[in-house]
């Protein structure tokens, strides 16, 4: 997370850390708890060549990475079938946990938005994660969860910005309909935040608007952060994840 600050302990109870096996269970992406047994993340975190179940664990909301780990096993990794690269889209995946999480005030699910929600500019939105704090600058110990408030940008404006200084023709969309833009040169998500949630407060309820997906660098001029637009994939999500009663 570029800019922003350490998150208060009471906030973002749906935030999770994805861990990969190595010399230690290393954080590599974020995710969000959308059901007691399901995590939403980015497809590029776990695909297109899907990792072994044995290589992956989920850590629920913790203030500092690695300090009080209780890693959870995953029983299924579901990558969106249309995913190939984040830039092309469909950068979304689901992880099913072996056991449902015991929800509490500290750990609970985030609400998915209604299909009609567009998340217009001016909406109060935040992105969270344990990723880099600037380009090629790692989050330092004790690895606190960070948060930053990011401005939403309309897709057509974001697309126009991404064409500045790019070889892509103006008639070729860079920012697609299944994407959402947010951030500026002082506030952005970054490497290691991928898969984590962009949430917006709508009528008093936090809704997950996006999944951290891609961008050219972090907090670069004319290069806002790009997120997978959750509303675009609600049907796909609910094909697997039970709706709340």
């Amino acid at each position: 997370i570029v800019g922003g600050q350490e998150a208060p302990r009471s906030k973002w109870p749906w935030q999770v850390s994805l861990r990969v096996h190595g010399p230690y269970w290393m954080h590599f992406c974020g995710g969000s708890l959308i059901h007691p047994q399901w995590v939403l993340t980015a497809a590029h975190c776990v695909g297109p060549d899907v990792k072994d179940l044995a290589a992956l664990r989920v850590q629920l909301r913790e203030q500092h990475l690695y300090y009080q780990d209780q890693l959870l096993p995953v029983s299924r990794i579901i990558v969106h079938p249309q995913f190939y690269t984040a830039q092309i889209g469909a950068d979304i995946a689901l992880l099913e946990l072996e056991e449902p999480v015991n929800v509490s005030s500290h750990v609970h699910t985030v609400t998915l938005p209604p299909a009609s929600e567009t998340f217009p500019p001016g909406m109060p939105c935040w992105v969270t994660g344990w990723g880099d704090v600037d380009n090629d600058e790692r989050l330092p110990p004790p690895f606190p969860l960070k948060q930053v408030k990011v401005p939403i940008m309309e897709n057509h404006i974001c697309d126009a910005k991404y064409h500045l200084g790019a070889y892509t023709g103006d008639d070729v969309r860079i920012v697609r309909d299944d994407m959402l833009c947010a951030g500026n040169t002082r506030r952005d998500s970054c490497q290691g935040d991928s898969g984590g949630p962009l949430v917006c407060k709508v009528n008093g309820t936090w809704l997950q608007a996006g999944v951290v997906s891609w961008g050219e660098g972090c907090a670069q001029p004319n290069r806002p952060g790009i997120y997978t637009r959750v509303t675009y994939y609600l049907d796909w999500i609910h094909h697997y994840v039970p709706k709340k009663p």
Epitope: H21, Q37, D49, V50, K51, D52, L53, A54, A55, P73, S75, R76, I77, E96, E98, E99, P100
Partner: antibody
Framework: EVQLVESGGGLVQPGGSLRLSCAAS????????MVWVRQAPGKGLEWVAF????????YYADTMKGRFTISRDNSKNTLYLQMNSLRAEDTAVYYC????????????WGQGTLVTVSS | DIQMTQSPSSLSASVGDRVTITCSAS?????MYWYQQKPGKSPKPWIY???DLASGVPSRFSGSGSGTDFTLTISSLQPEDFATYYC?????????FGQGTKVEIK
Amino acid sequence: EVQLVESGGGLVQPGGSLRLSCAASGFTFSDYGMVWVRQAPGKGLEWVAFISSGSSTVYYADTMKGRFTISRDNSKNTLYLQMNSLRAEDTAVYYCTRRNYDDYYFDVWGQGTLVTVSS
Amino acid sequence: DIQMTQSPSSLSASVGDRVTITCSASSSVTYMYWYQQKPGKSPKPWIYRTSDLASGVPSRFSGSGSGTDFTLTISSLQPEDFATYYCQHYHSYPLTFGQGTKVEIK
């Protein structure tokens, strides 16, 4: 001592049913995913089913789906395999095994129990 | 489903020989697991996460590989190594084992 002891095997007619049990001791049974593996006479190992620590997730080999049911009773430290509509090709030694908590290999195996399906 | 194919199915070797068993997965996996089984006995964990030796396994055993192709190697075969070896993946369900490689005395 960490131990798994299977029981319940025996001779059963085709179409019949049998319930295998696996008694666990020497470790906190409720912390571990558990697996049944079988081995037909003179053949190789075949994975049968998996159950997660709290029973929320179960998976079966395709040929066992709909006929076999894996379950567990953590209060009794016991794993079960209910086998229905048995066929001659289900004849095998059935092993109960524990999935290692961190590394997912099957680190503790029972001695096996022989199931013979024959008329 | 991922299929596992071991080769050879059996091999004859002498004490002191270097022996290599291969296991090929039908699609890419991160890790391979190996088990040793002797006649009339339960299988024993032998190698996990491709190259880590299970407790009590002698250092003459090693494991390697990535993607779809993995190997178990015995640098100098000893009398107690004559057994059947099975590979297994833990990529996704259903789990599958290889058909086994029987190492016999020449």
